[in-house]
């Protein structure tokens, strides 16, 4: 049967019927329902929500909806022994203590089981010592401290402001610098937008608000005790000493009221420049230690959290494909939250729920997609992408053979300014074409397309008249699908104006104030941005699952490969003498990119011309498109990061959230001037160029005529 025979809705109306069925009011109701109590991973409340979603997805009409459970390492504060930080005097007396909880928002005063702010997976400990302020605790911040300012963090407690990079990278950097503890805080410069009130009167962070979050450095491993394999009933678990990615020093987060008390006493060196100063009324001195009268006072951390193997539950829904049931298009987003999850994740989960309902409505009317659609409600994303990774580990053989695409669906909004898309280049044309067909929800763009408002507000830095689409990094559930398995992936959400709002993320991220009311009052009262995101995510899934020829354009990969090759070459050319000395050449990489470009062009011509009524040829061409992303996977992985296997993209070694292109070469070149053995270091650069060139060439050959 052709896909048209699998439906009683005419093909022209398929997508329209699906999109028209999506309703803002439903998303609003679902968001309300999902945010009334906390849904922390590993808790009974989150298990109950999993069962509710399972039941509702069945009602919506999916063919099957199952729970997939795993027993993974999670982390919780000790209920009877709270975490806090003190300033102690020379006698050891605590003269100041940080707060033990966030003041609850109005209407939530009597809610139980609000987990207090903590850094998940922090080891226990009570270190005391002098404080050093390390700005954002980025690699370059520690370079500034150690190499330029000659400040030694060894044996110190460091205080770092949240923002710019993933908190796990901050902790890793502090550990490498020899720190014995880390205090993370939210500075108003990054989490308080000028001219906006604090919650509950606006969307800014109040002084008592604190960002929770995990501080792991998993590098794609999933459950720290079962890297590479599912944490099932018969799993062999590593001992805690061998667990992947756990921090070795105590870490704790605080709000800016408490941070003020610590930072106002700082002595030592003045900050190096304006980029180290936040918005508190403190000097932002770096230290080490307190100034003058306070120089005998120290900081002491009291951390008593515990790591526990705990059961988590994914919800996996299936809508079987009519023509190619063995080809999977996956829409997944997480369900677990730190507290209420008003934005993260439930603004995304509510959108997924409505997408499932719409697909279910079409199915009840007799329609089926061409390919199978899998819907996932992931657990324990906040604890290191654990639910999605364990499920993918369990199903890796199926996924690597059958996975067409993965669309991520975490927070639908982080602002209400314009669209933000990160995806594989294979999806660029799909996203462009889809957004040209959707209406913009933006004020001043009535009657205009989403593509038009997006392009106007977020223009591509390279191509005029086109919108910015970013590289995929990590920090969300697409990681295992894209970085490990090589399944074409994408994500979309509404975002802030990055030009005018310099704070990191959104101010109330991972705080108790991320409530339904935050969204309904301040971000999206009409839920029109949520609806638009539902249309983008759902529209992408629809096209990927239903189009006869997969909506991937391999020529867009050719374009970015050339751009990335130019970029990495220019980085290397900052060392012309060494390149000459060690005979470093990028010729092989540029040659491979050239071959890829030519072969991709010829493939695209064949794609226009082939007989689409021949199911064997159609399947063959679609398989070449599906497996192209897979061809960029190196089975050996990146150096010291075996679960990051994509040669073109990986999460930055310095910021998990950011994507890096040609990461193997990039990391080999990074800080190469400081390496003790230049010959060995440049040898590794050459090896990484070889790996990249081979991989690009091998990928190109998958697009060649098969015989």
């Amino acid at each position: 049967k052709s896909s048209n025979e699998a439906t009683n809705i005419t093909p022209k109306h398929n997508m329209k019927a699906f999109l028209d069925e999506l309703k803002a009011e439903n998303i609003k109701k679902f968001l309300y329902n999902f945010t009334q109590i906390p849904h922390l991973a590993g808790t009974e409340q989150n298990f109950q929500l999993a069962k509710q979603i399972q039941s509702q997805w069945k009602e919506f009409g999916l063919d099957s909806v199952e729970l997939a459970h795993y027993d993974v390492l999670l982390s919780y504060p000790n209920k009877t022994h709270p975490n806090y930080i003190s300033i102690i005097n020379e006698d050891g007396n605590e003269i100041f203590n940080t707060s033990l909880f966030e003041p609850p928002p109005p209407g939530y005063e009597n809610v139980s089981d609000i987990v207090p702010p903590f850094s998940a997976f922090s080891p226990q400990g009570m270190p005391e010592g002098d404080l050093v302020y390390v700005n954002y605790a980025r690699t370059e911040d520690f370079f500034k401290l150690e190499r330029d300012m000659k400040i030694n963090c060894s044996g110190k407690i460091v205080i770092a402001r949240y923002g710019k990079v993933f908190r796990g990278n901050k902790v890793k950097n502090a550990q490498l610098a020899g720190a014995k503890g880390v205090i993370l805080y939210s500075d108003p410069a990054d989490y308080f937008a000028p001219g906006v009130k604090s919650y509950p009167d606006g969307w800014n962070l109040p002084g008592g608000g604190v960002q929770r979050g995990n501080i792991l450095n998993l590098n794609g491993a999933g459950d720290p005790l079962t890297p590479g394999y599912p944490a099932n009933e018969y799993a062999y678990r590593r001992g805690i000493a061998e667990a992947v990615g756990l921090p070795s020093i105590p870490v704790h987060p605080i709000g800016y009221y408490d941070a003020q008390k610590l930072l106002e006493k700082m002595g030592g060196s003045a900050p190096p420049d304006s980029s180290w100063r936040g918005s508190l009324k403190v000097p932002y001195n770096v230290g080490p230690g307190f100034t003058g009268n306070f120089s005998t006072q120290k900081v002491k951390m009291h951390i008593h959290s515990t790591n526990e193997v705990t059961r988590i539950y994914n919800v996996i829904g299936t809508l079987r494909g009519a023509v190619e049931p063995d080809r999977y298009v996956i829409l997944g987003g997480h369900r677990d939250s730190w507290v209420f999850g008003g934005i993260d994740p439930q603004s995304g989960a509510a959108v997924v729920h409505e997408i499932v309902r719409s697909f279910g409505t079409l199915k009840k009317e007799g329609w089926r997609p061409r390919r199978t659609i899998l819907f996932a409600s992931w657990d324990a994303e906040e604890f290191g992408l654990l639910g999605s990774t364990e499920w993918a580990e369990e199903n890796s053989r199926l996924l690597q053979e059958r996975g067409v695409a993965y669309i991520n669906a975490d927070s639908s909004i982080e602002g209400n300014y314009t669209l933000r898309v990160d995806c594989t280049p294979l999806m660029y044309s799909l996203v462009h074409n889809l957004t040209k067909e959707l209406k913009s929800p933006d004020e001043g763009f009535e009657g205009k397309s989403l593509y038009e408002s997006w392009t106007k507000k977020s223009p591509s830095p390279e191509f005029s008249g086109m919108p910015r689409i970013s590289k995929l990094g990590s920090g969300n559930d697409f990681e295992v699908f894209f970085q490990r398995l090589g399944i074409a992936s994408g994500r979309a959400r509404y975002t802030k104006n990055w030009e005018t709002n310099k704070f990191s993320g959104y101010p109330l991220y991972h705080s108790v104030y991320e409530t339904y009311e935050l969204v309904e009052k301040f971000y999206d009262p009409m839920f029109k941005y949520h609806l638009t995101v539902a249309q983008v995510r759902g529209g992408m899934v629809f096209e990927l699952a239903n189009s006869i020829v997969l909506p991937f354009d391999c020529r867009d990969y050719a374009v970015v490969l050339r751009k990335y090759a130019d970029k990495i070459y220019s980085i290397s050319m900052k060392h012309p003498q060494e390149m000459k000395t060690y005979s470093v050449s990028f010729d092989s990489l540029f040659s491979a990119v050239k071959n890829f470009t030519e072969i991709a062009s010829k493939f695209s011509e064949r794609l226009q011309d082939f007989d689409k009524s021949n199911p064997i040829v159609l399947r063959m061409m679609n398989d070449q498109l599906m497996f192209l992303e897979r061809a960029f996977i190196d089975p050996l992985g990146l150096p010291d990061r075996p679960f990051y296997r994509h040669v073109i993209y990986a999460p930055s070694s310095h910021n998990k959230y950011a994507g890096e292109s040609f990461p193997g070469i990039y990391d080999a070149l990074f800080d190469i001037e400081s390496k003790v053995d230049p010959s060995k270091a440049w040898g590794e650069v050459k090896r990484q160029i070889y790996v990249a060139a081979f991989t690009v060439q091998a990928a190109a050959e998958t697009l060649s005529e098969v015989a």
């Epitope: 370059e140 370079f143 500034k144 190499r147 330029d148 300012m149 000659k150 002595g267 030592g268 060196s269 003045a270 190096p272 420049d273 304006s274 980029s275 180290w276 000097p283 001195n285 230690g289 100034t291 003058g292 009268n293 120089s295 001037e673 400081s674």
Partner: antibody, heavy 115, light 107 residues
Framework: EVQLVQSGAEVKKPGASVKVSCKTS????????IHWVRQAPGQSLEWMGN????????TYNQKFQGRVTITVDKSTSTAYMELSSLRSEDTAVYYC????????WGQGTLVTVSS | DIVMTQSPDSLAVSLGERATLSCRAS??????VDWYQQKPDQSPKLLIY???TRHTGVPDRFTGSGSGTDFTLTISSLQAEDVAVYFC?????????FGAGTKVEIK
């Protein structure tokens, strides 16, 4: 070997501006703070401001009331100091120095302000 | 602004003898103090940073000490090449400020 090479001496009229350059070599340019310091004839040293070449973050001595601008060109590993609305008391030797602790110094540039 | 007061203004010491230079800050600066040497018609050179750490290549006859408001640079055995003006500088707060200098001569 770390080297900071400054541009040559300048003679300026009051009210004019001067831009002094400082070309660095022998180290990773983005790694060290660049400071500008001046020394009037027979006098002590006076700190004018600094810049982080990695991100362009600056701090200035408020005494110069917005008259001083420090910039960098990463592509040439060069720092610049521009002083505007010159007056006779700005006559001095202007030094660039690399490193938070002024680890390495340029040779100095004499700027003479005279009508 | 923090005022750095150096004393004495000048100091004459016999070759091989000890020279002790003082620098006082108008408020507590912790150990955020550097010492520089400037020879006639030359750029200054860094000697001591963080009050007591010798910069690379600086002879061990130069020693820095002190914290809070009182700092000392000691030249344990004066050599002919040590004739110069010595400046202290604080970097505990902006603007960074220098002392007026101590001129060291041979007696």
């Amino acid at each position: 070997e770390v080297q900071l090479v400054q541009s040559g001496a300048e003679v300026k009229k009051p009210g004019a501006s001067v831009k002094v350059s400082c070309k660095t070599s022998g180290y990773t340019f983005t790694e060290y703070t660049i400071h500008w310091v001046r020394q009037a004839p027979g006098q002590s040293l006076e700190w004018m401001g600094n810049i982080n070449p990695n991100n362009g973050g600056t701090t200035y001595n408020q005494k110069f009331q917005g008259r001083v601008t420090i910039t960098v060109d990463k592509s040439t590993s060069t720092a610049y100091m521009e002083l505007s609305s010159l007056r006779s008391e700005d006559t001095a030797v202007y030094y660039c120095a690399a490193g938070w602790n002024f680890d390495y110094w340029g040779q100095g540039t004499l700027v003479t302000v005279s009508s | 602004d923090i005022v750095m007061t150096q004393s004495p203004d000048s100091l004459a010491v016999s070759l091989g003898e000890r020279a002790t230079l003082s620098c006082r800050a108008s408020q507590d600066v912790g150990t955020a103090v550097d010492w520089y040497q400037q020879k006639p018609d030359q750029s200054p050179k860094l000697l001591i940073y963080w009050a007591s750490t010798r910069h690379t290549g600086v002879p061990d006859r130069f020693t820095g000490s002190g914290s809070g408001t009182d700092f000392t640079l000691t030249i344990s055995s004066l050599q002919a090449e040590d004739v110069a003006v010595y400046f202290c500088q604080q970097y505990n707060s902006y603007p960074r400020t220098f002392g007026a200098g101590t001129k060291v001569e041979i007696k």
